[in-house]
Interface confidence: low
């Protein structure tokens, strides 16, 4: 089965490669802003989820991780770091998220809005292709 | 530096290895065979850093370590003495090792657990 290779080039040391994306799954905790800055320093961004099973390689749901969603007062909407809008199908409860909060997510598909000053683990994502 | 890897689709890459993230449960012996059929080996733990990473993302799963009896040393399937601590239960018949969020533990080889496979690039 190993001959069925992915066409993607692999990721930096200590990053996880999965479906042509690279993920840095932190073991330390930072505030949302600190997490965002760290990801940027690694030429990546806080996780932007394409679908609810994007992290299905993570079977443990013991940790919540900051992801790259924040509320835009200008657009009165939750936006990913690249400016795209949050799909209502991803988190059915997003309308009740408090605009001042940031979003933490775990691999079970749970999303929480928490104070952005709370320290959580975080996931950075880089797309290879 | 980046290098181009050769992992099958739907496997993950991490630090020069490919990992198959299993969802199904098997006994330890069945897990060995399942990984062999995927041209890979049952999950092995090479260092503390890898163990820390795996315990963060995985639930309890078999690793490639066993012993013949409670009087024998823990060895890998390659026959090498296993150097990391395996927390042992009170049960003498627990002769296979599993990765757990709290570290490595012994368990009954015939019990069904999630398994993961690994292939070094």
């Amino acid at each position: 089965e190993l001959q069925k290779d992915s066409d993607c080039c692999s990721c930096h040391e200590k990053w996880v490669g999965y479906r042509c994306n690279c993920y840095f799954i932190s073991s330390e905790e930072k505030t949302w802003n600190e997490s965002r800055h760290f990801c940027a320093s690694q030429k990546s961004s806080l996780l932007q989820l394409q679908n609810r099973d994007e992290l299905d390689f993570m079977s443990s749901s013991q940790h919540f991780y900051w992801i790259g969603l924040s509320y835009s007062e200008e657009h009165t909407a939750w936006l990913w770091e690249n400016g795209s809008a949050l799909s209502q199908y991803l988190f059915p409860s997003f309308e009740t998220f408090k605009p001042k909060n940031c979003i933490a997510y775990n691999s079970k598909g749970n999303a929480l809005d928490e104070s952005c000053e709370t320290k959580n683990r975080y996931i950075c994502k880089q797309q290879l292709i | 530096a980046r290098h181009c890897g050769h992992c099958p689709e739907e496997w993950i890459t991490y630090s020069n290895s490919c990992y198959y993230i299993g969802k199904e449960k098997r006994t330890w012996a069945e897990s060995l065979l399942a990984c062999t059929s995927k041209n890979s080996s049952l999950l092995s733990i090479d260092n503390e850093e890898e163990m820390k990473f795996l315990t963060a993302i995985l639930t309890s799963s078999w690793i490639d370590v066993f012993r013949d009896s409670s009087h024998h040393p823990w060895v890998t399937i390659n026959g090498l003495t296993f150097k990391h601590e395996i927390k042992e239960s009170d049960h003498a018949e627990h002769n296979c090792a599993m990765l757990h969020v709290r570290g490595l533990f012994s368990d009954e080889c015939g019990s069904s657990k999630i398994y993961h496979c690994k292939h070094k690039l």
């Epitope: 443990s60 409860s93 079970k108 929480l112 | -």
Partner: antibody, heavy 123, light 113 residues
Framework: QVTLRESGPALVKPTQTLTLTCTFS??????????VSWIRQPPGKALEWLAL???????YYSTSLQTRLTISKDTSKNQVVLTMTNMDPVDTATYYC???????????????WGQGTMVTVSS | DIVMTQSPDSLSVSLGERATINCKSS????????????LAWYQQKPGQPPKLLIY???TRKSGVPDRFSGSGSGTDFTLTISSLQAEDVAVYYC?????????FGPGTKVDIK
């Protein structure tokens, strides 16, 4: 029959660490999908969830108290232990442990509770 | 975290009459993949631990009298006691278990008018 029983000191001094033990019978935390939580209730006030540990040793903590709490289990003794550091008089409460199941998605409700143990924090 | 609110704070109802308690969550507790509402109701009598009455918003726990019923979906939920009995005097709490933070409401005290 499933039962849970909390034990620990009735009185602790401010700044001390509280250690509470939940001893249970009728189920095992080595069984898939079973979990134990700690919940507290200050006198005359509402319930507050503190922490949960499941069969897989996954742990969850209250956001506001996560820096002070540690939950662990001893499967062979059928016990779950909660430690809470830097105790303060506002932590005076009845502390309960309760069982829950993770059968359909995240986790289920707390179906069986212990009787609770009253902890007073005072110098 | 999800915030749970309950109304009213307290409720006095005549024996045999209907008692209705409302619970609101600050975000939806409906889990899309199984279409279940992760909301429970508990009854707590003085000096006793809470007792689970209703889970999945509307499923009665085995052994709970059928005068207790739960309804609602998403963010708004109701516990109804169709015919109040003396032994129903207690504080009633709603709780969400969607978020892995297991937040409780502040409670509603029910007594007899």
């Amino acid at each position: 029959q499933v039962t849970l029983r909390e034990s620990g000191p009735a009185l602790v001094k401010p700044t001390q660490t509280l250690t509470l033990t939940c001893t249970f019978s009728g189920f095992s935390l080595s069984t898939s999908d079973l979990c134990v939580s700690w919940i507290r209730q200050p006198p005359g006030k509402a319930l507050e969830w503190l922490a949960l540990i499941d069969w897989n040793d996954d742990k969850y903590y209250s956001t506001s108290l996560q820096t002070r709490l540690t939950i662990s289990k001893d499967t062979s003794k059928n016990q779950v232990v909660l430690t809470m550091t830097n105790m303060d008089p506002v932590d005076t409460a009845t502390y309960y442990c309760a069982r829950t199941i993770a059968a359909a998605g995240p986790y289920d409700a707390f179906d069986i509770w212990g009787q609770g143990t009253m902890v007073t924090v005072s110098s | 975290d999800i915030v749970m609110t309950q109304s009213p704070d307290s409720l006095s109802v005549s024996l045999g009459e209907r008692a209705t308690i409302n619970c609101k969550s600050s975000q939806s507790v409906l889990y899309g993949s199984n279409n279940k509402n992760y909301l429970a109701w508990y009854q707590q009598k003085p000096g006793q631990p809470p007792k689970l009455l209703i889970y999945w918003a509307s499923t009665r726990k085995s052994g709970v009298p059928d005068r207790f019923s739960g309804s609602g979906s998403g963010t708004d939920f109701t516990l109804t006691i169709s015919s109040l009995q003396a032994e129903d005097v207690a504080v009633y709490y709603c709780q969400e278990y969607y978020s892995l933070r297991f937040t409780f409401g502040p409670g509603t005290k029910v007594d007899i008018k």
